[in-house]
């Protein structure tokens, strides 16, 4: 912590501005008022302090604040919030999005996962919901942040939003979170027709149970191997070799390419060679021909 | 006084590895954000990455990103940049420099990396 | 990115003259701008931060003004050891651009 020293008279700081770039540590520390700070914040950001200057100027904000700092500080943190934890900022509560719309540019491009994720965490929480303007926002301003929310905040995203989602936006979605959104998903585009419904639902099929994908197999879909890697895996076992040729359709021939990668190796081990050589793709692995598949999870559920 | 010590460069192949460190004394390395600059032959001078005191926070310039990473061990008081799949234009002259946001206050003396078939 | 250009790229000049260098950025910077000296071979060396501050150690013959778009380095009265290559580069935003450089020769 940076030392208690007394201001000298000359150094009295009346006004944030310029002057202060020459200021050592130990003279800021005296002579910067924090409320004097809190409410100079939108001067902060264009006054060219070091690493070091701006440490300061945190910790003088954190005596001032240690439940948290309120939004009007927030909204002007500027690169101040290059310094904040995810600590830090699972202290405030902000519900404007001029608010999120200003710290995501500043966080734009530097890889601080952990920091964004909290602040959007911090912004649904303050809404009480992820609604149709924050996922706007998160869409225009930081692509794929969607994804940095946990199922539980996913799951109060209405299905009403799920429409202005890109595929893009869920790129670095995981299971979990895509178990969360399918459902919606499902929901919000109920009403559209065969071809059309496949388009916007297909970057969700990550949460698709198997009913599902047997559904969309019927439906002349040729859904793309990226696609299909990226279904669960026990949602693909399930799947007959016919149902996976119809779910892909033309691109059934990618299988032989992803022949060693899950969910594709999985889903070989436990079809029938015989099954598997009706595709002609040379793929290998399958249960051989005469032996009995015992499902002994058949008969655990039932003893 | 500071000091900043690169080492690491070399003769490299099109799609080769290369790691480089910068060891740093004279100062207190964990107070401080730190940076890698490259000066290709003859040419100017380009700003490729940093990282934060804690190493928390990264940002990586588009024409290395995905292919170099930056890291910090502070208990060894040393900067590293991992160069992968390495391109005749990475060739250049690579300087570790102590980051004030205001400038880049310190500079090592550069090491030579050379990406050719 | 913010673009930085210097101007000239290069000047001749003599042991004792007054030598300007400019420096334009692409947008506003405010005062977020370093200049640096390098000499063949060298590291560069940091002369001035935040538009107009002289390093430590730096000789006062060197000293820098503007702000917004438009900087100036100057040097009053050119030294034997100042012949070299000059940068400005900016701190205003990510990611940091450096001019192209001027070199400054004897005449």
């Known amino acids: 912590d940076v030392e208690r020293t007394t201001c000298p008279p000359e150094k009295e700081v009346h006004e944030i501005d310029e002057n202060l770039i020459f200021y050592k540590k130990r003279e800021l520390e005296a002579c910067v008022d924090a409320a004097l700070l809190a409410a100079q914040m939108d001067r902060v950001d264009a006054i060219p302090f070091t690493y070091e200057q701006l440490d300061v100027l945190k910790h003088k904000l954190d005596e001032l604040y240690p439940q948290g700092y309120p939004e009007s500080v927030i909204r002007h943190l500027g690169h101040l919030f290059l310094k904040m934890s995810p600590e830090d900022i699972r202290k405030w509560n902000v519900t404007s999005l001029e608010t999120l719309k200003a710290l995501l540019k500043v966080s734009k491009g530097h890889e601080m996962s952990a920091q964004v994720a909290t602040l959007i965490d911090r912004v649904v929480v303050g809404r009480g919901q992820l609604d149709k303007d924050t996922a706007d926002t998160l869409t225009a301003f930081c692509p794929g942040c969607l994804c940095s929310l946990s199922p539980e905040r996913l799951s109060s995203v209405p299905p009403s939003v799920i429409g202005a989602v890109r595929p893009q936006d869920l790129d670095t979605c995981g299971p979990r979170q895509l178990d969360v959104l399918y459902p919606k998903a499902r929901l919000a585009f109920q009403n559209m027709s065969g071809s059309e419904y496949f388009v916007k639902i297909r970057p969700f099929l990550g949460g698709a149970p198997t009913e599902d994908l047997k559904a969309l197999s019927q439906q002349n879909v040729s859904m793309d191997l990226a696609t299909f890697m990226k279904l669960r895996r026990e949602a693909v076992l399930p799947l007959t070799v016919a149902e996976v040729q119809k779910l892909l359709g033309p691109h059934v021939e990618g299988l032989k390419v992803e022949e060693q990668h899950s969910p594709v190796r999985d889903w070989i081990l436990k079809q029938r060679q015989d099954d598997l050589d009706t595709l002609g793709l040379g793929l290998q692995g399958g249960i051989p021909n005469g032996y009995l598949i015992l499902d002994l999870s058949v008969r655990e559920a039932l003893s | 006084q500071v000091q900043l010590v690169e080492s690491g460069g070399g003769l490299v192949k099109p799609g080769g590895s290369l790691r480089l460190s910068c060891a740093a004394s004279?100062?207190?390395?964990?107070?401080?954000?730190m940076s890698w600059i490259r000066q290709a032959p003859g040419k100017g001078l380009e700003w490729i990455s940093y990282?934060?005191?804690?190493?928390?926070?990264?940002y990586y310039v588009d024409s290395v990103k995905g292919r170099f990473t930056i890291s910090r061990d502070n208990a060894k008081n040393s900067l590293y940049l991992q160069m992968n799949s390495l391109r005749a234009e990475d060739t250049a002259v690579y300087y570790c420099?102590?980051?004030?946001?205001?400038?880049?206050?310190?500079w090592g003396q550069g090491t030579l990396v050379t990406v050719s078939s | 990115d913010i673009q930085m250009t210097q101007s000239p790229s290069s000047v001749s000049a003599s042991v004792g003259d007054r030598v300007t260098i400019t420096c334009r950025a692409s947008?506003?910077?405010?005062?977020?701008l370093a200049w640096y000296q390098q000499k063949p071979g060298k590291a560069p060396n940091l002369l001035i931060y935040?538009?107009?501050s002289l390093q430590s150690g730096v000789p006062s013959r060197f000293s820098g003004s503007g702000s917004g778009t438009d900087f100036t380095l100057t040097i009053s009265s050119l030294q034997p050891e100042d012949f070299a290559t000059y940068y400005c580069?900016?701190?205003?935003?990510?990611?940091?651009?450096f001019g192209q450089g001027t070199k400054v020769d004897i005449k």
């Open positions: 935040a538009a107009s």
């Open positions: 580069q900016q701190a205003n935003s990510f990611p940091r651009t």
């Open positions: 004279g100062f207190t390395f964990s107070d401080h954000y």
């Open positions: 947008q506003s910077i405010g005062s977020w």
């Open positions: 990282i934060s005191n804690s190493g928390s926070i990264i």
């Open positions: 420099a102590r980051d004030v946001r205001t400038a880049f206050d310190y």
